[in-house]
Interface confidence: low
């Protein structure tokens, strides 16, 4: 009902709570004396449905017959509309439509830990659309009933607030949960079950781990977990690592030994645990433990290059190059590298520990056989040192690469290509292909790379700490026993045409001729490998068109002759330097008039 | 760029209670780890209470604050709460929240100062009577 009625009443049969599908009839009739003013008979009554009108009759009620009705709840308004005046309202009502519950289905229990309390689970199937009350009934052993009710309006879980004691672990106890409205009831299937079927333990907790001797073989996993548990799985990864290892055990008491951990590996463990071996649930998983494992001495050895550099007549420089050992490899953190250079007729020794480089530089004579040895140390012991004879990597004609090419291959790539020596290939051990920035000056502090290649291959992609537009020095050794060949090629990733021309800084007379000296183009202007240079020159006031000079690059050349110019004619000279993507813009531009007498 | 700025801090007597918290903005933390730490002076500063990040926020207390503290956050607004009941003088210091741009359901990481990439200015706390 709504509003007060005063002046009449309306009525729905059979209920205003009703099935879907079913028919309603609703009557509404005014009071004695409450109708219009003058004339009963010009009394109108109206039916709304919401505020759309329905239906309409003249006298004191009105009977209406309503089908097809929607889910949920419904407003009909009765209404009296009287002549020269506002529609006045009578009463009016709700009707609700809905079904019955459906059976509850899938009811579960579960109790959190073995002080933790029973709640329930199920599910309600599809919405009656009617206030509906679900009664959840637990009985067990000794005819002990638990029942508790829910009004929540989606109602699919329910706490007992009871605990289950493992006295008797096999009793039965059963569930059934009850789902009532307007239009029916309806009972799930019962659903029995013991102590060691429902109760699901408290994840494991104070995980800890232990490394005997520091060592990573002797390592015990630590827990606690509630006295019943019987069986754990344990799971742990590399923390970097998205799959996990599993490991299944019984009767751990809290305690297990993991024997398959890398050293210097930080891992993740955690843990869960179940009361029976086919009764119950897991736990959840237990808070991870993050823990770094000791380190082991380094296993593997260091990959070791040089390179040799004349100083005079009696000194020679040697430089170290090494590369560091991978994690797994250096199974922990490398303190320092141990490198010990040998002379090997005289036996005399030099060791020096090296932290924070991975490359020495040392001055020795050019006489003697010279050995190295290169070891990387951690905390735990050293790596088997890596033993290399100095030789003259370049000094067998016959053992150089022939045909070395050096080709772009995709963004920050070159492709080396070498032929085998002339000499017997099979002779070849390896090849090492070493590349560095191209600086003039042959800088020897710019950083070295390399790689060793199996001696079937012919063929190289060199990808490491390769920049575009940067020229390098690509060098292919071939090594034979205490002997090696080499050959050497300049290379780039990606060039374009150089984005200066080199700047003429003097312009010298010489018997008739003239000196051009120039200063080197800036590497980061080069722009890849350089080409050539080009020398232009015109006489000074002409409109003719530049004569030029095409001399190959090379690396530490800054000068070249001209002879073809006239005496005593002022020229302008200028220069430009390319690489295979073409020229540079002008470089400075200088005049010059040749003094000396024509020929 | 990214802000915290705690609040709520001030004197209250032995027993006392307060309510601190910590606005984030310039970026949304739902997802990631949040902390209270403090320092009292002439001390190092110290975790309190740590939210993991990680789906259901596991809470993380030091001992010495655990039944008294409570930790939360809501997501929505960005903010997170420290509700500190039955306050003790040694509870004086300067409250500091502190937020991760990761997940942490490490206790040992949650209590490292390391483990979190931004800090507010600190709210000062002091318990007298």
């Known amino acids: 009902k709504i509003d007060a009625c005063k002046r009449g009443d309306v009525t729905v049969k059979p209920s205003h709570v009703i099935l879907l599908g079913s028919t309603v009839n609703i009557t509404c009739s005014l009071k004695p004396r409450q109708g219009c003013f003058h004339y009963s008979r010009r009394n109108k009554l109206i039916l709304y449905k919401f505020d759309r009108r329905i239906n309409f009759h003249h006298g004191h009620s009105l009977n209406s017959q309503v089908t097809g009705l929607p889910l949920g709840t419904t407003l009909f308004v009765c209404k009296l509309a009287c002549i020269n005046s506002d529609e006045i309202q009578i009463c009016g009502a709700e009707i609700f439509v809905g079904v019955a519950p459906e059976q509850p289905q899938n009811l579960s229990c579960i109790q959190k830990g073995e002080q933790g309390t029973v709640a329930c689970t199920w599910e309600r199937g599809r919405d009656t659309h009617l206030y509906t009350e679900y009664t959840l009934q637990l009985s067990g052993p000794k005819n002990l009933t638990w029942q508790k009710q829910c009004k929540d309006i989606y109602c699919d879980y329910l706490d007992f607030g009871i605990n289950l004691t493992p006295e008797s672990p096999e009793s039965n106890f059963t569930a059934k949960v009850t789902a009532v409205n307007s239009l029916g009831s309806s009972s799930s299937l019962p659903s029995t079950f013991t102590f060691l079927d429902i109760v699901r333990p408290l994840p494991p907790w104070d995980i800890r781990i232990k490394f005997q001797k520091a060592s990573v073989s002797r390592c015990t996993l630590y827990w606690r977990d509630e006295g019943l548990v019987l069986l754990n799985r344990l799971r742990y990864r590399p923390s970097n690592s998205r799959l996990w290892n599993m490991v299944n055990v019984t009767k751990a008491k809290g305690r297990h030994d993991l024997l398959d951990l890398k050293p210097f590996t930080e891992y993740e463990f955690q843990i869960s645990s179940k009361l029976h071996l086919y009764k119950g649930s897991w736990s959840d998983w237990s808070e991870s433990l993050r823990a770094q494992t000791p380190e082991e001495e380094p296993t593997g050895m260091l990959d070791v290059w040089y390179m040799k550099r004349h100083i005079d007549y009696s000194r020679q420089q040697i430089s170290l190059f090494w590369k560091n050992l991978s994690v797994s490899e250096a199974r922990g953190k490398i303190l320092h590298y141990q490198v010990t250079l040998q002379e090997l007729t005289g036996g005399k020794a030099m060791t020096q520990n090296i932290t924070g480089h991975t490359s020495w530089t040392t001055v020795i004579p050019r006489t003697g056989n010279w050995a190295v040895a290169v070891s990387a140390a951690n905390s735990k012991g050293s790596s088997l040192p890596t033993r290399i004879n100095i030789m003259n990597l370049c000094e067998a004609g016959l053992l150089a690469p022939r045909q070395v090419s050096a080709n772009s291959e995709g963004m920050d790539n070159i492709l080396v290509t070498w032929q085998p020596p002339r000499k017997d290939p099979s002779a070849v051990q390896e090849y090492v292909v070493e590349w560095r920035e191209l600086h003039p000056g042959g800088d020897t502090q710019v950083p070295l790379n390399w790689l060793r290649s199996r001696p079937y291959n012919v063929s190289a992609l060199i990808s490491e700490n390769i920049k575009s537009y940067i020229c390098y020095e690509i060098r292919v050794y071939a090594l034979s026993g205490d002997q090696g060949g080499c050959s050497s090629i300049l290379g780039n990733s990606k060039h374009k045409a150089p984005l200066s021309g080199p700047h003429i800084n003097a312009i010298t007379e010489e018997k008739g001729s003239i000196l051009i000296s120039w200063n080197s183009i800036p590497v980061q202007e080069q722009m890849g490998c350089l080409l050539h240079y080009r020398i232009y020159w015109k006489e000074r006031d002409s409109n003719s068109q530049p004569q030029l000079c095409e001399i190959p690059y090379r690396v530490s050349q800054n000068s070249h002759p001209i002879n073809s110019l006239q005496p005593r004619v002022t020229y302008v000279l200028w220069m430009t330097a390319l690489t295979a993507a073409g020229e540079s813009s002008h470089g400075n531009e200088r005049e010059f008039c040749l003094q000396g007498k024509a020929n | 760029q990214v802000q915290l700025q705690e609040s709520g801090g001030g004197l209250v007597q032995p027993g006392g209670s307060l309510r601190l918290s910590c606005a984030a903005s310039g970026r949304t933390f739902s997802n990631y780890a949040m902390a209270w730490f403090r320092q009292a002076p002439g001390t190092e500063r110290e975790f309190v209470a740590g939210l993991s990040g990680s789906g259901g926020d596991t809470a993380f207390y030091d001992n010495s604050v655990m039944g008294r503290f409570t930790i939360s956050r809501d997501s929505a607004k960005n903010t997170m709460w420290l509700q500190i009941n039955n306050l003790k003088p040694e509870d004086t210091a300067v409250y500091y929240c502190?937020?991760?741009?990761?997940?942490?359901?490490?206790?040992?990481?949650?209590?490292?100062?390391?483990?979190?990439?931004?800090w507010g200015q600190g709210t000062q706390v002091t318990v007298s009577s």
């Open positions: 502190a937020a991760a741009t990761h997940v942490v359901v490490s206790y040992g990481l949650v209590r490292r100062r390391g483990t979190y990439d931004y």
